[in-house]
């Protein structure tokens, strides 16, 4: 296997995620696709934790951009081993993907504490209140108590959507930075198997 | 000056439906709830349901669910009550009630009210 | 359901005097509001959030309590203010309201 080609794939796949990550945090501040939620500090408060743009987003760049340079065919190795430097290069994304890990693992971490919360709404009492957030999660298997938020419309739907579509993205980030650990450190201590004559694709 | 202004007495026979109209002036109608409230006549209050009038998401009492329907129309900026299988214990003057958001939640300008009387 | 009691039914006081309206729940709530209503017209809000009076309402209006037990104080009647007096709760669904006090001239 080789393990520059698949650090390249992961990366390539991070990057991905990780705008997706952004995309699906930024939606959470406009239920149903109206401004005045965010401007009225009418969020969930785990839509500020800002998960899925630090923690899967931004966070996740890192060791995405650092995986895809791993490919590149230009080291010019140390000690007169001409893989040298790649096998440093390798294990040093290690320390990338430790970051990535962090990144996905918060989250991750948030999305479930924002889906087990509940979102933030106007109840049926006119009261701005976490209706669901004594249910311990189980308002998700009972949709009909979600008539009970009466505003912003669609906001349990809105808010179960996208927290777990970043609990889900969150969740294969962390997957795959835990491989590019593996295959780091692999790389890193079997050796560089990347050459002119072998190539394989992701 | 604020104003909720609601449409004229009612006469129907059991088992038909009546609807009371309720238009909103001088403020903004969907920053504002909208409360029904019933009076049977010598009688306490008693409360229907309500109706977000921004999103237009209705919350019914018990005793009246199936039976009423809250709408909003908030071009004219008008709420209506519609209620259905009328009964001869439904006579009662009927309020539609503004009130705001939070954690008081409290009743500051009432309809002055339309009767509606059932009767065979 | 939370059930408000009001007592007493009917109060009957002269002008000048001091009137103390009670309203009792029968499980706690967080905050009572008070309403004033005269034969042919609608109800009108005195009191608010247990304690605070509503605009325009003249400050012989008071009203306290707290859990089960709530009061509306009216320092010194006026004429104007024999009429029937609602407390409300909105503490949980369904809202209520009480049976109502009548506050009648002696």
């Known amino acids: 296997m080789c393990y520059g080609k698949c650090a390249r794939c992961i990366g390539h796949s991070l990057v991905g995620l990780a705008l997706l990550c952004i995309a699906a945090n930024i939606l959470l501040y406009f239920p149903n696709g109206e401004t005045k939620y965010a401007s009225e500090n009418h969020l969930s408060r785990f839509v500020w934790f800002f998960s899925g743009i630090v923690g899967g987003g931004l966070l996740m760049l890192l060791p995405a951009f650092v995986f895809i340079g791993l490919e590149q065919d230009d080291c010019c190795g140390c000690c007169g081993h001409e893989n040298c430097g790649k096998r440093c290069a390798m294990l040093s994304s290690v320390l990338a993907a430790l970051i990535g890990i962090a990144g996905s693992g918060y989250c991750v971490i948030v999305a479930a504490l924002g889906l087990a919360e509940g979102p933030l709404c106007l109840d049926s009492l006119g009261q701005w209140n976490y209706t669901f957030a004594s249910t311990e999660g189980q308002y998700l298997l009972d949709t009909s108590t979600w008539s009970e938020c009466t505003e912003p419309k669609h906001i349990v739907e809105w808010n179960v959507s996208l927290f777990s579509i970043l609990l889900a993205l969150g969740g294969i980030e962390f997957i795959l930075c835990l491989i590019q650990v593996i295959n780091g450190v692999l790389g890193g201590i079997c050796g560089f198997c990347c050459s002119h004559q072998q190539q394989y694709d992701c | 000056e604020v104003q909720l202004v609601q449409s004229g007495a009612e006469v129907k026979k059991p088992g038909a439906s009546v609807k009371v109209s309720c238009k909103a002036s001088?403020?903004?109608?969907?920053?504002?709830?909208v409360k029904w409230v019933r009076q049977a006549p010598g009688q306490g209050l008693e409360w229907m349901g309500w109706?977000?009038?921004?999103?237009?998401?209705?919350i019914y009492a018990a005793d009246f669910k199936g039976r009423v329907t809250m709408t909003t129309d908030t071009s004219t900026s008008t709420a209506y009550m519609e209620l259905r299988s009328l009964r001869s214990d439904d006579t009662a003057v009927y309020y539609c009630v503004r009130f705001q958001y939070g954690d008081y939640r409290y009743f500051d300008v009432w309809g002055q009210g339309t009767l509606v009387t059932v009767s065979s | 359901e939370i059930v408000l009691t009001q007592s007493p039914a009917t109060l009957s006081l002269s002008p000048g005097e001091r009137a103390t309206l009670s309203c009792r729940a029968n499980?706690?709530?967080?905050?009572i509001n008070w309403y004033q209503q005269k034969p042919g017209q609608a109800p009108r809000l005195l009191i608010y959030g247990t304690a605070n009076l509503a605009s325009g309402i003249p400050a012989r209006f008071s009203g306290s309590g707290s859990g089960r037990d709530f009061t509306l104080t009216i320092s010194s009647l006026e004429p104007e203010d024999f009429a029937v007096y609602y407390c409300?709760?909105?503490?949980?669904?369904?809202?209520?309201f009480g049976g109502g006090t009548k506050v009648e001239i002696k």
């Open positions: 409300q709760q909105w503490s949980s669904n369904p809202l209520t």
């Open positions: 109706i977000n009038t921004y999103t237009g998401n209705p």
């Open positions: 001088g403020y903004t109608f969907t920053n504002y709830g």
């Open positions: 499980s706690g709530i967080s905050f």
